[in-house]
Amino acid sequence: VPRWRQQWSGPGTTKRFPETVLARCVKYTEIHPEMRHVDCQSVWDAFKGAFISKHPCNITEEDYQPLMKLGTQTVPCNKILLWSRIKDLAHQFTQVQRDMFTLEDTLLGYLADDLTWCGEFNTSKINYQSCPDWRKDCSNNPVSVFWKTVSRRFAEAACDVVHVMLNGSRSKIFDKNSTFGSVEVHNLQPEKVQTLEAWVIHGGREDSRDLCQDPTIKELESIISKRNIQFSCKNIYRPDKFLQCVKNPEDSSCTSEI
């Protein structure tokens, strides 16, 4: 008789999760010389230890501390790109602008990007059937707590001018409930961060509106200014041209507004 298993509302652990994490770790440490000292088996053991045999609605940031310690990484604090609801373009950008970094360009972010995982209380099994949904089940689930932890640390490390890419096609360009709005914004350190520069990415080719006037952008501006950080906002009317101009800044068409 099969043992009764908790049914959660979200998708289960990504198939071949342990193998994927281990393979990603090996690949990352090969590509990034500064992380060659990392022992990927230890990283996987620490990752596993954060959620295996624990109730998937009772995960804490402390559970991830051994993994955080092993994945400690120094990125240039003045070259950080945050993003909200526009991950693909942010990643395309940092693939071209190699001296800037999203969270997913760091080891820990790279390991977990697009993956789901959870375990079960009192068993060493990984749950491949279902995992808790943030809204429908619980917020203290393994995936949400992981991203909250690494996002907080990433924001805390930032300095000087921090950039954030925002999706101008969304009804809420700045969403207080996003990871950026709920975690990163509040963990930027005013003693280190002078300015937050928002890049609002336009969706439609004929969209010439100034999305920096959007009420949610003004809400972000207010939150940031109250934290004694300057706020800057720029419209990116043509994201395709924007990327092209990052690749080829000398192009004559790149002097005009993008």
Epitope: P190, E191, D210, E221, Q230, S232
Partner: antibody, heavy 119, light 107 residues
Framework: QVQLQESGPGLVKPSETLSLTCTVS????????IHWLRQPPGKGLEWIGV???????DYNPSLKSRVTISKDTSKSQVSLKLSSVTAADTAVYYC?????????????WGQGTLVTVSS | EIVMTQSPPTLSLSPGERVTLSCRAS??????LVWYQQKPGQAPRLLIS???SLETSIPARFSGSGSGTDYTLTISSLQPEDFAVYYC?????????FGQGTKVEIK
């Protein structure tokens, strides 16, 4: 190109209200904050206050009880009113644009206008 | 409020000389410091922000340094057009405050 120009009476009587206008061009008041500063003859600079792009204001506590900054976005104008003036308010008054959307320092300044407080 | 103190009040120098101007804050301003240049009858002109970031079109002979409460503006080789008054300003907290200025005059 970005320009700011202060205008208003060059002479104000003691106890009266000093009123100045800053007219801007080359950018929108919905995109940047405008600061007012002053410089008594032969002395240093003093920050008076700012009106942010959304219309909220911050003032220097030393002047807060006497100062009001407002704006008319459609006319691209920002006004400064300083009440109950004395000879100590004699200065060159500048308006200046914040460097970024919500900027705490200034990349473009008006040429300044000298206001003398005297009877 | 944060008090900004500049020294010396006046410097008498010749073209080509290296200039070092000092600005001290009454408390830590966390690198929120700008430098302006002002010539007689003109408005101040922004030179450097965030301690070290040179504004566009400002010559590379100007540079800034410092941290905490102590900051420095250096002009590596004084040009005739550099004779002016230099002000530092903190933007860590309101009210934003300025030093009293250092006048760089021709010897």
């Amino acid at each position: 190109q970005v320009q700011l120009q202060e205008s208003g009476p060059g002479l104000v009587k003691p106890s009266e209200t000093l009123s100045l206008t800053c007219t801007v061009s080359g950018f929108s008041l919905t995109s940047y904050g405008i600061h007012w500063l002053r410089q008594p003859p032969g002395k240093g600079l003093e920050w008076i206050g700012v009106i942010w792009r959304g219309g909220s204001t911050d003032y220097n506590p030393s002047l807060k009880s006497r100062v009001t900054i407002s704006k008319d976005t459609s006319k691209s104008q920002v006004s400064l009113k300083l009440s109950s003036v004395t000879a100590a308010d004699t200065a060159v008054y500048y308006c200046a644009k914040g460097k970024v959307t919500t900027g705490f320092y200034f990349d473009f300044w008006g040429q300044g206008t000298l206001v003398t407080v005297s009877s | 409020e944060i008090v900004m103190t500049q020294s010396p009040p006046t410097l008498s120098l010749s073209p080509g000389e290296r200039v070092t101007l000092s600005c001290r804050a009454s408390e830590d301003i966390y690198n929120r410091l700008v430098w302006y240049q002002q010539k007689p009858g003109q408005a101040p002109r922004l030179l450097i922000s965030g301690v070290t970031s040179l504004e566009t079109s400002i010559p590379a002979r100007f540079s800034g340094s410092g941290s905490g409460t102590d900051y420095t503006l250096t002009i590596s080789s004084l040009q005739p057009e550099d004779f002016a008054v230099y002000y530092c300003q903190q933007y860590w907290s309101t009210p934003y405050t300025f030093g009293q200025g250092t006048k760089v005059e021709i010897k």
